[in-house]
């Protein structure tokens, strides 16, 4: 039975040209995390393998950085980065847990940062 839950940064906003950290946390399970995939709509942004480390998609190499932890840092944000992001935790023996984050990239310099995992 899958008992775990994923806590995420939820709905967040950031300024165009800035950076943001996407963060998820899996709790309430003793399952072993084997890999975490970060996806944006139909694109795979990055993979963090528990044994092997990080690989960033070749199409996002310039704008995505691994970490902190199992999180992902998006840089040089554009309004086209607005949308849903998913952290997909592959675990053993539980299976797959998915967390959702909605990012809004604002033109204005008054983007609000409300989530506790976010860059201040």
């Amino acid at each position: 039975m899958m008992t775990g839950t994923i806590e995420t940064t939820g709905n967040i906003s950031a300024e165009k040209g800035g950076s943001i950290i996407l963060q998820c946390h899996l709790s309430s399970t003793t399952a072993q995390v084997t890999q975490v995939n970060w996806e944006q709509q139909d694109q795979l942004l990055a993979i963090c393998n528990a044994d092997l480390g990080w690989h960033i998609s070749p199409s996002f190499k310039d704008r995505v950085a691994p970490g902190p932890g199992l999180g992902l840092t998006l840089q040089s944000l554009t309004v086209n980065d607005t949308g849903e992001y998913f952290c997909i935790y592959h675990t053993y023996p539980d299976g797959t847990y998915t967390g959702r984050i909605f990012l809004e990239v604002l033109e204005s310099s008054v983007a609000e940062h409300g989530a506790r995992f976010q860059i201040p």
């Epitope: 890999q35 709509q41 139909d42 694109q43 795979l44 993979i47 393998n49 092997l52 480390g53 690989h55 998609s57 070749p58 199409s59 190499k61």
Partner: antibody, heavy 119, light 107 residues
Framework: EVQLVESGGGLVQPGGSLRLSCAAS????????MYWVRQAPGKGLEWVAS????????YYPDTLKGRFTISRDNAKNSLYLQMNSLRAEDTAVYYC????????????WGQGTTVTVSS | DIQMTQSPSSLSASVGDRVTITCKAS??????VAWYQQKPGKAPKLLIY???ARHTGVPSRFSGSGSGTDFTFTISSLQPEDIATYYC?????????FGQGTKLEIK
């Protein structure tokens, strides 16, 4: 069992067009990035195109941009490569391949379909 | 573009021999390197990904190592069925690029 079966190859004249297809089975097609890779006779492997899971983004080497178009139909479990303005140097075996779920790497390949561009 | 320079281009070895192929990237590709085996008239098969991880079902005599720009592929004890051409590939950056291949023959 993962299966990828290419079709649509053949003999075409320079300047002509051809559409290759790849029928996928044995896995949830819509969950995977897909690729086309080609191999000219007696030569090495050359990446041709990539497409994301839903088909929203496509990638090509600069040398092929504008002439080749990768697409997919997830309802039909099919991948396509539209090739226009074909040249003699496009003569090759064309393979479709699936991206691994563990990494950005091609883990399963079809048997290939042969394209010959000649007058 | 990242060039993958593979060496040697061909080699002849005896059954039971340890065989080593090297691949040098023209710039840092971290560990985003795969190795494929291609037998005549057949499609390539993935052997190694993430520079050193064996793909499902690949025998333990095949191994890979390296990071950055220098990578090595090893067959610890050559078997007759290993006769093939082997390719390295980097997938760190677009365009994805392959080495020119190493044709392995039995002495």
């Amino acid at each position: 069992e993962v299966q990828l079966v290419e079709s649509g190859g053949g003999l075409v004249q320079p300047g002509g067009s051809l559409r290759l297809s790849c029928a996928a089975s044995g896995f949830t097609f819509s969950d995977y990035y897909m690729y086309w890779v080609r191999q000219a006779p007696g030569k090495g492997l050359e990446w041709v195109a990539s497409i994301t899971k839903g088909g929203g983004s496509t990638y090509y080497p600069d040398t092929l941009k504008g002439r080749f178009t990768i697409s997919r139909d997830n309802a039909k479990n099919s991948l396509y490569l539209q090739m226009n303005s074909l040249r003699a140097e496009d003569t090759a075996v064309y393979y479709c391949a699936r991206q691994s779920s563990y990494d950005f790497v091609m883990d399963y390949w079809g048997q290939g379909t042969t394209v010959t561009v000649s007058s | 573009d990242i060039q993958m320079t593979q060496s040697p281009s061909s080699l002849s070895a005896s059954v039971g021999d340890r065989v080593t192929i090297t691949c040098k990237a023209s710039q840092d590709v971290d560990t985003a390197v795969a190795w494929y085996q291609q037998k005549p008239g057949k499609a390539p098969k993935l052997l190694i990904y993430w520079a050193s991880a064996r793909h499902t079902g690949v025998p333990s005599r095949f191994s890979g190592s390296g990071s950055g720009t220098d990578f090595t592929f090893t067959i610890s004890s050559l078997q007759p069925e290993d006769i093939a051409t082997y390719y390295c590939q980097q997938y760190s950056n677009y365009p994805l690029t392959f080495g020119q291949g190493t044709k392995l023959e039995i002495k």
